[in-house]
């Protein structure tokens, strides 16, 4: 059973992940460059279901494509280089989902823009955090 300390740690990690995703979204929304409009032409794959921490596997699998798109922003809208930002997110995701169980991600049929993708995972984080508090 999860202890209060492990729950608190999970909550903090989710809050950190949430802030990172929100920072990316804000950076994109503030970005004045032809690359922003081009960013919207990139497809992201969405989870069929995202209600548990194990479903973060679906986010992990899309981090490389996310990094590629963020590289278009030439980093000036982000405090960190996309590579470092995605690396930080990857560390948190791995800790949150755990590496013991292998979960095969199931994707929804419809793909999403980067904005829709980030909003989906922001909502996921907020939802899980709310169940922990």
């Amino acid at each position: 059973a999860p202890t209060s300390s492990s729950t608190k740690k999970t909550q903090l990690q989710l809050e950190h992940l949430l802030l990172d995703l929100q920072m990316i979204l804000n950076g994109i929304n503030n970005y004045k460059n032809p690359k922003l409009t081009r960013m919207l032409t990139f497809k992201f794959y969405m989870p069929k279901k995202a209600t548990e921490l194990k479903h973060l596997q679906c986010l992990e699998e899309e981090l490389k494509p996310l990094e590629e798109v963020l590289n278009l922003a030439q980093s000036k809208n982000f405090h960190l280089r996309p590579r470092d930002l995605i690396s930080n997110i990857n560390v948190i995701v791995l800790e949150l989902k755990g590496s013991e169980t292998t979960f095969m991600c199931e994707y929804a049929d419809e793909t999403a823009t980067i904005v829709e993708f980030l909003n989906r995972w922001i909502t996921f984080c907020q939802s899980i955090i709310s169940t922990l508090t």
């Epitope: 004045k32 409009t37 960013m39 919207l40 032409t41 990139f42 497809k43 278009l72």
Partner: antibody, heavy 116, light 108 residues
Framework: EVQLVQSGAEVKKPGESLKISCKGS????????IGWVRQMPGKGLEWMGI????????RYSPSFQGQVTISADKSINTAYLQWSSLKASDTAIYYC?????????WGQGTLVTVSS | SYELTQPPSVSVSPGQTARITCSGD??????AYWYQQKSGQAPVLVIY???KRPSGIPERFSGSSSGTMATLTISGAQVEDEADYYC???????????FGGGTKLTVL
């Protein structure tokens, strides 16, 4: 209602210069990219380049770099496409379009004919 | 340079389903957009982000994408759908915008 209204048809001789226009209305002209697309007689659509009227940041297709100049005057919500020395092969319809990652609204097109 | 490949022409009888394909190596990760251009007119967006239909576009127009192929489907094609159709996307980097060569749809 979003509208892009282009200048009228032009008939020119090779070597002459030309500047055609595209006036936007019904939206914040300065915060959307405007693209230019060429369609030669009986042919398909070709992307030429884009401009951000807010600060005139411009990007060109490699095929059109150095061949044309794209500019804008945000004070009158107008984008321009110009040639310093026209060639017969520039004969085409030129469209401007609002770029939101794709072209959602288009002008009616400007027919440019270059003939001696 | 990146290319999008379309068939030059597609013919259907009125009421039949017309399918126009567009292939490109980057399409697994890039959205496809579709434009209709009737003779002497400016292009009109009929499908964006693979499958979304702008307001005012009839329901018979739909889009799908799988792997390197995007498809525009016109279910129950009508005579007024006769036009040139162009797919549009960007290369892997997102830097270069590309139109397909266009497909002439004949409804006879």
């Amino acid at each position: 209602e979003v509208q892009l209204v282009q200048s009228g048809a032009e008939v020119k001789k090779p070597g002459e210069s030309l500047k055609i226009s595209c006036k936007g209305s019904g939206y914040n002209f300065t915060t959307y990219w405007i693209g230019w697309v060429r369609q030669m007689p009986g042919k398909g659509l070709e992307w030429m380049g884009i401009i951000y009227p807010g600060d005139s940041d411009t990007r060109y297709s490699p095929s059109f770099q150095g061949q044309v100049t794209i500019s804008a005057d945000k004070s009158i919500n107008t984008a321009y496409l110009q040639w310093s020395s026209l060639k017969a092969s520039d004969t085409a319809i030129y469209y401007c379009a609002r770029d939101t990652g794709y072209f959602d609204y288009w002008g009616q097109g400007t027919l440019v004919t270059v003939s001696s | 340079s990146y290319e999008l490949t379309q068939p030059p022409s597609v013919s259907v009888s009125p009421g039949q389903t017309a399918r126009i394909t567009c292939s490109g190596d980057a399409l697994p990760r890039k959205f496809a957009y579709w434009y209709q251009q009737k003779s002497g007119q400016a292009p009109v967006l009929v499908i964006y982000e693979d499958r979304k239909r702008p307001s005012g576009i009839p329901e018979r127009f739909s889009g799908s994408s799988s792997g390197t192929m995007a498809t525009l489907t016109i279910s129950g094609a009508q005579v007024e759908d006769e036009a040139d159709y162009y797919c549009y996307s960007t290369d892997r980097s997102g830097d270069h915008v590309v139109f397909g060569g266009g497909t002439k749809l004949t409804v006879l």
